[in-house]
């Protein structure tokens, strides 16, 4: 992520980029893309790019259109370096199991979990 | 899932029986497990999930413990349910950016955004 | 910008406990363990513990466990470190820090609070 | 619990002087070691981390090496500022353990 604009500024600004452009994006009434079932967005990363991919391909560029899907691909640049720090690190297994804790816990609480 | 527990309950279960079986768990000293250096949790499932596999293979089984191993299993295979569910539905473009506008609403207020 | 700020000095008899706080701002407090370390004067530091403020999940060194308590008030993202029976050589500068991942190094430090132990 | 012993425990030297400190841990700790610098009367500062990694804003005459149980901290060429007290930490194992520092002094 260039230092420019820190991710957090950067994902607002695609949400408003996002709001501004969703007419001319809609525009193709024949295009279908992968939209997951439910909401534990994480999990779905690899799919949600993969949509935005699709889409960009289908989508006349210039303007603030072309900076919409730059800012994309850098959110998506970003989620990537996070996923890398999923697995960088060998630690003991006490630390192991705490972050375990703290991922069941996670799930326990704040995930969408259906029945 | 097995119909007999939700799996909002088995979590539960799990935690308890991460907490019983903790000792046992870190008896093995010289063992590295990689653990996320963030806590956007869900990115990485895949290095949680094969760490539990390092663990249980270098854990004596018996018990309440070989319930807990089990139990991370069913986890494991509700999750990965919920990610095939990721790419199972082609939607129109406007219910796409619906979701991907979620995706980036739930990144700008929940995500851990290191600057 | 990410800051600690403690507590003020303390006086405190021997027998007593005291309750240092560490108030963090501008992150997200739930997403960073906080630890606690102690300097004696003239001496090194010594690690007491850390605490989770996501889960309340605390780790003691064994020297420290069963008399400091480490606990944390989300919503006013304060972290707080009580230690009980004191005695003459827990005086000391208490500091807080932040650990930047997960069991990570300390990327920010509180400014620390003299805790003095006298009769 | 892992021991880490620093060494020296005092050195003098001068400005534009090369300044190494050594850390040995009791056992492995991977690269799981920071180095701290504390000046009279503040709070520790954290320089380096993962043995070698200089944290953003800290200068890079501070360098840091090793892993296992060996680990070194280097300043390159010694400023006025510079003159401390410094810290080892290993962050691999519970509980956390600290050198006994080294106080770098002005010869």
């Known amino acids: 992520i260039p230092t420019e604009i820190p991710t957090s500024a950067l994902v607002k600004e695609t949400l408003a980029l996002l709001s501004t452009h969703r007419t001319l994006l809609i525009a193709n009434e024949t295009l279908r893309i992968p939209v997951p079932v439910h909401k534990n967005h994480q999990l779905c990363t690899e799919e949600i790019f993969q949509g935005i991919g699709t889409l960009e391909s289908q989508t006349v560029q210039g303007g603030t259109v072309e900076r919409l899907f730059k800012n994309l691909s850098l959110i998506k640049k970003y989620i990537d370096g996070q996923k890398k720090k999923c697995g960088e690190e060998r630690r003991r297994v006490n630390q192991f199991l705490a972050y375990l804790q703290e991922f069941l816990g996670v799930m326990n609480t704040e995930w969408i979990i259906e029945s | 899932i097995p119909t007999e527990i939700p799996t909002s309950a088995l979590v539960k279960e799990t935690l308890a029986l991460l907490s019983t079986h903790r000792t046992l768990l870190i008896a093995n000293e010289t063992l590295r497990i990689p653990v996320p250096v963030h806590k956007n949790h869900q990115l990485c499932t895949e290095e949680i999930f094969q760490g539990i596999g390092t663990l249980e293979s270098q854990t004596v089984q018996g018990g309440t413990v070989e319930r807990l191993f089990k139990n991370l299993s069913l986890i494991k295979k509700y999750i990965d349910g919920q990610k095939k569910k990721c790419g199972e539905e082609r939607r129109r473009v406007n219910q796409f950016l619906a979701y991907l506008q979620e995706f980036l609403g739930v990144m700008n207020t929940e995500w851990i955004i290191e600057s | 910008q990410v800051q600690l700020v403690q507590s003020g000095a303390e006086v405190k008899k021997p027998g007593a406990s005291v309750k240092v706080s560490c108030k963090a701002s501008?992150?997200?407090?739930?997403?960073?363990?906080i630890n606690w370390v102690r300097q004696a004067p003239g001496q090194g530091l010594e690690w007491i513990g850390y605490?989770?403020?996501?889960?309340?999940?605390?780790r003691y060194n064994q020297k420290f466990k069963g008399r400091a308590t480490l606990t944390v008030d989300k919503s006013t993202s304060t972290a707080y470190m009580e230690l009980s029976s004191l005695r003459s050589e827990d005086t000391a500068v208490y500091y807080c820090?932040?650990?930047?991942?997960?069991?990570?190094?300390?990327?920010?430090w509180g400014q620390g609070t003299l805790v003095t132990v006298s009769s | 619990d892992i021991q880490m012993t620093q060494s020296p425990s005092s050195l003098s030297a001068s400005v534009g002087d090369r300044v190494t400190i050594t850390c040995k841990a009791s056992?492995?700790?991977?690269?799981?070691l920071s180095w701290i610098q504390q000046k009279p009367g503040k709070a520790p500062k954290t320089l380096i981390h993962r043995a070698d990694r200089l944290i953003d804003g800290v200068p890079s005459r501070f360098s840091g090496s090793g892993s296992g149980q060996d680990f070194t901290l280097t300043i390159s060429s010694l400023q006025p500022e510079d003159f401390a007290t410094y810290y080892c930490l290993q962050y691999d194992d519970f509980p956390y353990t600290f050198g006994q520092g080294t106080k770098v002094e002005i010869k």
């Open positions: 501008g992150y997200t407090f739930t997403n960073h363990h």
């Open positions: 056992q492995d700790i991977n690269s799981y």
């Open positions: 605490i989770n403020p996501y889960n309340d999940y605390s």
């Open positions: 820090a932040r650990d930047y991942g997960n069991f990570w190094y300390f990327d920010v």
